[in-house]
Every structure is written in C-alpha cells, then in structure tokens.
Amino acid sequence: IVLRPSRVHNSEENTMRALTLKDILNGTFSYKTFFPNWISGQEYLHQSADNNIVLYNIETGQSYTILSNRTMKSVNASNYGLSPDRQFVYLESDYSKLWRYSYTATYYIYDLSNGEFVRGNELPRPIQYLCWSPVGSKLAYVYQNNIYLKQRPGDPPFQITFNGRENKIFNGIPDWVYEEEMLATKYALWWSPNGKFLAYAEFNDTDIPVIAYSYYGDEQYPRTINIPYPKAGAKNPVVRIFIIDTTYPAYVGPQEVPVPAMIASSDYYFSWLTWVTDERVCLQWLKRVQNVSVLSICDFREDWQTWDCPKTQEHIEESRTGWAGGFFVSTPVFSYDAISYYKIFSDKDGYKHIHYIKDTVENAIQITSGKWEAINIFRVTQDSLFYSSNEFEEYPGRRNIYRISIGSYPPSKKCVTCHLRKERCQYYTASFSDYAKYYALVCYGPGIPISTLHDGRTDQEIKILEENKELENALKNIQLPKEEIKKLEVDEITLWYKMILPPQFDRSKKYPLLIQVYGGPCSQSVRSVFAVNWISYLASKEGMVIALVDGRGTAFQGDKLLYAVYRKLGVYEVEDQITAVRKFIEMGFIDEKRIAIWGWSYGGYVSSLALASGTGLFKCGIAVAPVSSWEYYASVYTERFMGLPTKDDNLEHYKNSTVMARAEYFRNVDYLLIHGTADDNVHFQNSAQIAKALVNAQVDFQAMWYSDQNHGLSGLSTNHLYTHMTHFLKQCFSLSD
C-alpha cells in the first residue's frame, strides 16, 4: 500500500514553474496574429497552417482553397500575391535578405484558370521587387536596379529605365539610407489607382561616401561589403521622381515631376508619394534641415503629357520647436473629393492631431484634440474616419481604435475597442477591407494577443480569427512575472515606466534592478503589450526587477517631451533614466548595490552614457550595437534631431555627446560591449572606437563581437548573445548559476 498525502491547497503553485532561458530562446511562448489579405469588401485570403492559400467569404461564411500547398512546394514558395483580376498568382521563392526591408527573390507566375505555371517570357532572377497593378494583371518589377513592365504575365517585358547600376543608380527601389530612414519600404514605385500610371523614384548615389567592412565568410580571403552610406554631414543621394503611362509606355516615356521651388533651393529629400486619382498625385518633400516639409499636389496635363504642380497646391508644414513630424512626416489620407485630405500634425498646444485640409494648412479644421495624440489614420470612407490614439484613460502606451462619423454634423466620435476586452486588450491595430465593409482587429495585449473580425457598419464582432489557445494552455503552469505601468512626476516632466516584478514579489525585500532602455527620439518602450521574452525570464527565474522608462524625447505625449532632445541627443534621455532609478530606489525594494542597465542600438548609446555618468548608481551594464558618436550614424536620421556637424551649426554637441569622451568614467563599472562585425546600420566602427578609447584610458571592460552578423544578431548568435548577457548579469548581481 502506497500512502499519498492528500493534495495540499496550494498544489497548483507547486506544479507551476519559472520561465527558463531555453523557453525564451526556443520561442516556446511566442504568439500568433491574423492579418487578413483582403481582396474585396468581403473576401480575404489566408495561408493555412498546412500552406494552402484559402479564400474566405465573410458573407457566405464559405472558404475554399485557390492554391494548393503542392503547387507552393513545387517551387519552394514562401510567399504569394494574387493579381487583382484573380487570374494569376505570383509565387515567391529563394528569399535572400538584404537590409531591413529589402530582399531579392525568384518569382513564378501561376495561371489559376488552367492550373499551370506561365511559360515563355519568364521573369529574370533574382528580382529586387515585383508587384501587380491595382487593377488587372500588369506587372512591374525591378531587376538589376532597372524597372520593367509587363502588360500580361506571359508578355515580353518593356524596359522603363536603362541607367540602373549597382551602388550608383537605383530605380524603383531605395538606396540604403532611404530604405532605412525615410521610406521604410523595399520599394520606391507606386501604381496609380487604376494602373494607368506608374510613378517611381530614381536615387543617384554616385557621390555618396562608401562604408566598407569585411565579411569573413568561409573563404581564404574575406569579402568587402561596400554600401553608399551618407553619415551626418556627408553628401546625400540625389532623388528624382518620374511617372510613366503604362498603357503606352513608349509614347512619351517617363516624365519627371517638378520639385517645389522652396525645396529645390538647397539639399532636400523626397519623403513619400500618394496617388489621389489616376491623374492626380501627391508628393511630399523635406528640406535637408528637416523642419520644413512641403506637400505638393500635381495634376496630369493631357495636352502636354506632363505633370503640373501649381504653387496653389503646395502645403507647407513647419516646426519651430523641433523637426517636422514625429519619426516621419505623416502622410495624407485623401477624401472622396480628391483634393481635400486628413493629416496628423501638431496642433497649437503641441499635440499631434488629425486635421482636415481643404484649401490651405492655415485654414485646417482640427478633427481631434486633447492632451493625447492621434497616432494613425487607418481609413476614410464617405461617412467614417477610423484612427488610433492613446486617449483612453490617459495611458500613452495604449492604442485604441476610434471611428469619427464625418458624414453627419457635428461629427460624433466612438471608441470601437475601448470596452471590448478591457483587461486583455489595450493595444490594438486594425486592417480594413475595401470601403471598410469589414475589418480585423489585432490586439497585442497586455493579455494574450487575439485577432477578431468585425462588421464595418455596426462594429459587431463576427468571429475570432486567432486567440492563441495553445499559448494560453502552455502558460497555465508558468510563473509569469507581474507587470505594472505607472508614472513618476519629476520637475514638471511625466516619466511613464513599466516595472516587471518577480512572481513572488514582496515589497519588504530587496531586489536587483535591471533598466532596459531604448530612448530614441519618437520611440516608446512603455506599451501595454504582451511579451514573454528575456526580461520576463530574468524576473521569473532570476528574481530581478526590470524597469523600462520613457523619458524626454519619447513619443505620443506631446511636443514638449518629444522635442526636448532636439539638437542635444544624449543628455536628457540619460538624465531621465537616472532620475527614474533614484525614484525606484526610494520605493524601498531595490538593492541599490545591484543596479544594471542595458540597451541595444540607441539603447546601447544611452546605457553607455548612463554607465559613464559618474553617478555611482550602476554596478554594471551592457551595450549591444551602440551608436558611439553621431558623426558615425546616417545623415537622414542624425541630422533630423541634431542638425549638421559643422562649426556654424551643431558640431560642438556632436563632439560632446560621444561615448568615447567619457571613457574615464567607465573605470568604476563593469561594462559589456557587444557588436556584430557586419552591421550595415550602426557600423562596428562605433564599438571599435569605444574599445579604443577604453584601452587608451586603460579601463578594463568586457566585449563580444559576432562575426558576419548585422544589427539584429539573429540565428545562433541570438542564443549565444542572451546566454552571454545572462551570465554577465548573474555575475554582476552575485546570483548563483
């Protein structure tokens, strides 16, 4: 006879376990989202778990497969795109990553009517970008930096540009700096709404200085990677915008769109293109000193076959307290009259809000207002405008979706998401079908993410698209840390913070504190989102308290906070992290002898400066791929916030804000410096210079490089990185291994 003790009342707690580092590295607790690939007002495509492409009709409630996994597998396709006339699908394979957004791939065209691949006039390989026209099945693609057009998939291609050259001239795709810092896309071509015209950008990088670094690979000699990369103050790419008639492309050829005179008078950028109708296009331009933006509406002149951009259709957006826009200048959303538009920009109180522009920006009608910010305009229909904001309950780190009825007067506002799943869901995005007939809501947290389908007229929930049941079940026996989002009021500044606390947190005990920082201009770290990541593990298993703080320079709390860092990066971001740490110590549960800070990229810069602040607050810290001097970083990003590194502009602060200038101050902290040698974004040069300065100052430090890894330190490097950082922190905090 085996005597078993009766189940104790807290047996559930006994069966629960802490998170392990292995859980995090294996992605055991990752979540899924569901974004419908809308193909009409009531239909969407979705790639099923077994890789079939399935069409769903919301109104009939029916679904059926239009492309089998067998066809996908026959060309090893990892992605697809249905032509708007539903006759063809492109299948994408041989994905080869380039930079953040860009990649090359091989494309196959499949004819759905006869169930065969299109033979004859096959596409060249590898292709840099390919897309269908918005109507029919014309194809535009970029191959070897030139743009080609096909009227039908089986037709021979028409070559639009001929001057494309690697690292010199880019047609229809951005160069490095435009991809990363301006467009945030892999493409620089735009079809008009009915596919009559194709607009594209040409980037001339001929005079841009080149960053060169070694790629070690497996060969006897390393390769050298060369990228035209303008650092602060350097020569920038020269951009031109062209439009071609795709019906008769050979007739007049590409026509250049004129640049507004007030922009063309000095160095400038092109920031975005928005088609309004087939014969009206809107271009946005930005001065190199990025506090003046011009939105220019241009019309097609049939008689001359040219594009005319009258001065009366130029709208100027200027910032007197910082740079134009938030991270980027916002883009317009045009209304049905094809001339007036909705746009987010700062109101007189310094909060970003939706404005309606009918004739001039000066006469703009403010649509939203308050001490919060409108963040994104999703869709404008005849009677509704859908947008997201952080208004609800005054939490800047939340996102709810709102509908404003613009068809009625006065317009009424309704929060679509605020009360749907209030505890679980406070951070939403949305995806709308044609005419906003239906929409999907994707909730990112703070609870387990959930995606739902809704009626665009009534906002009624139709069905759950993805609720992450498996994740929910997997987490049932996991001791997750507790999270709280609160704010500190310090010297008229509000510092929002997120604190991640060990599962058995006890306010009367003392805990080691790790600050995780990013802190870049217009960023936000304190968000009501779900995550099971490295810091969750550090709290759950290793008993650390982790804090994230949004200080000056961060977004969505008004221009006063955002533009506080203008022309002086590296000062207030660091001060605010230090201030927050002091406040956390005052709370009584932090062991002030065991405080660390870590960050990646901009966060690596801030963590390095915090460690070298001379406060004695931090015992140790980690910088992953940090910027070390703003003279080493990209012109478009850096100059937006810092101006130019010239004597008559802001050179002094460029020099004062380097990590190297503070080398001596690292003497009393344990510093771990980490960087990938093939980082195309924040060049290894940054860490090389920190290391050199520390050596010259005879300051001891720890370092790790990752050979041939870029800014993301992906793959096996990720595992090595987090294992290494864990050991470092545990040693710093005297935690047993």
């Epitope: 009409s40 007002g41 009531q42 239909e43 069409l55 009709n57 109104e59 009939t60 029916q62 059926y64 497969t65 239009i66 492309l67 089998s68 249905l82 539903r86 006759q87 759905l112 009517s113 169930g115 044609d434 007939k437």
Partner: nanobody, 117 residues
Framework: QVQLQESGGGLVQAGGSLRLSCAAS????????MGWYRQALGKQREFVAG???????NYADSVKGRFAISRDNDKNTVYLQMNSLKPEDTAVYYC???????????WGQGTQVTVSS
C-alpha cells in the same frame, strides 16, 4: 458534393448572341465571387469574366465590351450575356468561383458554344 450546372450554349452565327446560365447545388453558394472560364479545343482553359459577391466585375481583354456577367442572388444563378460573338469565342464554357476552387469536383461539364462564320 458541389454541382455547378452550366447551360445556354449552342450554335450561333458570328455577330449573334447567347446567354449562359450557371446554377449551383451542394455546398458552394453562388453568393461567392463567381467567374466564367472557357477552353477551346487544344488550348488551355482561360478566364472570361468574373463578378465579386459585391457586384464588381472584371473581363478578359478579348471579351471587353461584348460580354456582360451578372448574377441573380435570389435564384442562386450567374449569367454570361455574350454579344457580337466571333468564331474565336468557340469553346466549352465553364463557371466556377472566381478565382476557381481547387477541388476534384471543382469544374462542371461546361456548355459548348460554337460560333460559325
């Protein structure tokens, strides 16, 4: 099992007209986006016209301005009105969802249209 029944085909002189009908039984609703396709002897099947459940239409370049697709949701039927017929329109005409479903029973028998010159 889904049954798509095409009808209305026949022999017609060049320049003439025909109206094809497609009715469904089984699990596929004609409220889905529907299309007409055709296959001429020795050629591959090709798209002719499509209509979304919202009523948006699309046509192959070769039939634009001559053919019109429509639907009667109450009767669960999709039509193809073919005017100004040409000899090159001779084919077996099929209806299916648009884009077509891939299933063993996806395609019906079709209806033969012959245009004589």
């Amino acid at each position: 099992q889904v049954q798509l029944q095409e009808s209305g085909g026949g022999l017609v002189q060049a320049g003439g007209s025909l109206r094809l009908s497609c009715a469904a039984s089984g699990s596929i609703s004609m409220l889905n986006s529907m299309g007409w396709y055709r296959q001429a002897l020795g050629k591959q099947r090709e798209f002719v016209a499509g209509i979304t459940s919202g009523g948006r239409t699309n046509y192959a370049d070769s039939v634009k301005g001559r053919f019109a697709i429509s639907r009667d949701n109450d009767k669960n039927t999709v039509y193809l009105q073919m005017n100004s017929l040409k000899p090159e329109d001779t084919a077996v005409y099929y209806c299916n969802t648009w884009p077509p479903r891939i299933a063993f029973d996806s395609w019906g028998q079709g209806t033969q249209v012959t245009v004589s010159s």
